[in-house]
């Protein structure tokens, strides 16, 4: 019982975690205008990842797209790469997941393909929250640089124009979804984790009988007993998490692809 | 079409208040923030406040935060701007205008001459 | 407060003849997001309400005859009438539409020769 609500608790999560992801990835307010210096202004800038906004106290929003790829920084390319590969995964993830569910019978499923359904979900949810709070940690960190080299640009005095005509920005609303959402994938990837541990059959362990031989008291016990017993050191789920930090790595390396696109 | 008709002229003494009323239609007025703008004889011109009737929501100048408030009727399509506190220096023409995209004031009212004298 | 100078005051042009007003802001109205300049232009006949001519520096509003353009970016902008008409005669006015308070300049008055 603890095993199902487990599962079906790390399913919700990430089911709500990877929507998060969704909603950050489409919102526009990836960064806002830092009011500090102008806190009066009639027009008010945000950008996202796909568009920039311009919102004029007269009510109205303007929004154009990047529509270049090409002229568009390696550093919101990577960004943009790590969210969508994070709602893939996590698309995949759930797909899986729904399969897995010990609540759902699918005709004569066994109950071990249910525990490695949910251990490849599991895996591809922590992967896909990893891959959302790397992606919105990359853009944050990237606006507190630009935020303090135009800092230092309005004090340093780089011509009249530049202090008048650069816009700072700061962390917007996306950014917070992103890490939340992203964290939530994480923890619901982690639960299906450990409800797989509850989900996969303990294999029939013989006991251990003791045989008492003439003048002697040693206890002999069948040579297979420790390497088939359950989760204890098996390498074949060794391997598997092995694999999920492979795909890990894979998927933190992969933007760097298109760095030069 | 849009139009924005004013009360008419008015005549006050000094340390008295004044209301003036701006009454849009052609429309929709709930969406539209409404500006308050004066005008002294032979002087320019000098943005007052305005308001988002939709919420209420208010934004003033500076110099007239403490004396002006506007104020909107939804169901009258009507906005108010009341001056406290009247002053000879006061006496102006006090036109209404429509804030539009650009943050431009497109439409404006006919104008409401205030006097003040005692 | 953004500070709006016109010049001149006042201005006296021929029939004909192509009248430049200035405006210079104490700030950049120059928004970076969309690389527009918040600053728009009015025309005020005697005895009437102002009228919008050009936003954005150089947009001319619907209906404004084409002998009306705005030019300028950041600090520096120009209204250039390019062959003055009787009905033009009025005063102009610039206004901020970049920042609070909403400002105008102090207005410049076109006059025929």
């Known amino acids: 019982m603890a095993v199902t609500a487990c599962q079906g608790l790390g399913f919700v999560v990430s089911l709500i975690g990877i929507a998060g992801i969704i909603a950050a990835t489409c919102m526009d307010q990836w960064s806002t205008q830092d009011l500090y210096n102008n806190p009066v202004t009639a027009v008010f800038n945000y950008q996202g990842l796909w568009r920039s906004c311009v919102r004029e106290s007269s009510g109205f929003t303007e929004c154009r797209g990047y529509f270049t790829l090409l002229g568009l920084p390696a550093m919101l390319q990577a960004v943009r790469a790590l969210m969508i590969v994070g709602i893939v995964l996590g698309a995949i993830g759930l797909l899986v997941s729904i399969f897995a569910l010990k609540c759902i019978r699918i005709g004569s499923m066994e109950d071990s393909a249910k525990a490695n359904m949910t251990l490849t979900s599991g895996i591809m949810f922590i992967v896909s929250g990893l891959c959302a709070i790397a992606g919105v940690s990359v853009f944050a960190n990237m606006l507190v640089t630009n935020f303090w080299m135009s800092t230092a640009n309005m004090y340093t005095g780089m011509g009249g124009m530049v202090q008048t005509v650069q816009t700072r920005y700061t962390f917007g609303a996306a950014l917070f979804v992103g890490w939340v959402a992203g964290g939530l994938t994480l923890i619901g990837g982690v639960m299906m984790c450990i409800a797989c541990r509850g989900l996969a059959p303990e294999e029939t362990n013989y006991k251990a009988v003791s045989y008492h031989a003439s003048g002697h008291s040693v206890a002999y016990k069948p040579g297979g007993f420790k390497a088939s017993t359950g989760f204890g050191s098996n390498t074949k789920n060794k391997k598997i998490y092995d694999g999920g930090a492979r795909t890990e790595d894979e998927v933190q390396s992969y933007p760097s692809k298109h760095d030069y696109v | 079409q849009v139009q924005l008709v004013q009360s008419g002229a008015e005549v006050k003494k000094p340390g008295s208040s004044v209301k003036v009323s701006c009454k849009a239609s052609g429309y929709a007025f709930s969406n539209y923030w409404m500006n308050w703008v004066r005008q002294a004889p032979g002087q320019g011109l000098e943005w007052m406040g305005q308001i988002y009737p939709g919420n209420g929501d208010t934004k003033y100048s500076g110099k007239f935060n403490s004396r002006v408030t506007i104020t909107a009727d939804k169901s009258t399509n009507t906005a108010y701007m009341e001056l406290s506190s009247l002053r000879s220096e006061d006496t102006a023409v006090y036109y209404c205008?429509?804030?539009?995209?650009?943050?431009?004031?497109?439409?404006w009212g006919q104008g409401t001459l205030v006097t003040v004298s005692s | 407060d953004i500070v709006l100078t016109q010049s001149p005051d006042s201005l006296a042009v021929s029939l004909g003849e192509r009248a430049t007003i200035n405006c210079k802001s104490s700030q950049t109205l120059l928004n970076g997001g969309n690389q527009k300049n918040y600053l728009t232009w009015y025309q005020q006949k005697p005895g009437q309400p102002p009228k919008l001519l050009i936003y954005w520096a150089s947009t001319r509003e619907s209906g404004v005859p084409d002998r009306f353009s705005g030019s300028g970016s950041g600090t520096d902008f120009t209204l250039t009438i390019s062959s003055l008409q009787a009905e033009d005669l009025a005063v102009y006015y610039c206004?901020?539409?970049?920042?609070?308070?909403?400002?105008f300049g102090q207005g410049t008055k076109l006059e025929i020769k």
């Open positions: 206004q901020n539409g970049y920042s609070y308070p909403l400002t």
């Open positions: 205008a429509r804030f539009y995209y650009g943050n431009v004031m497109d439409y």
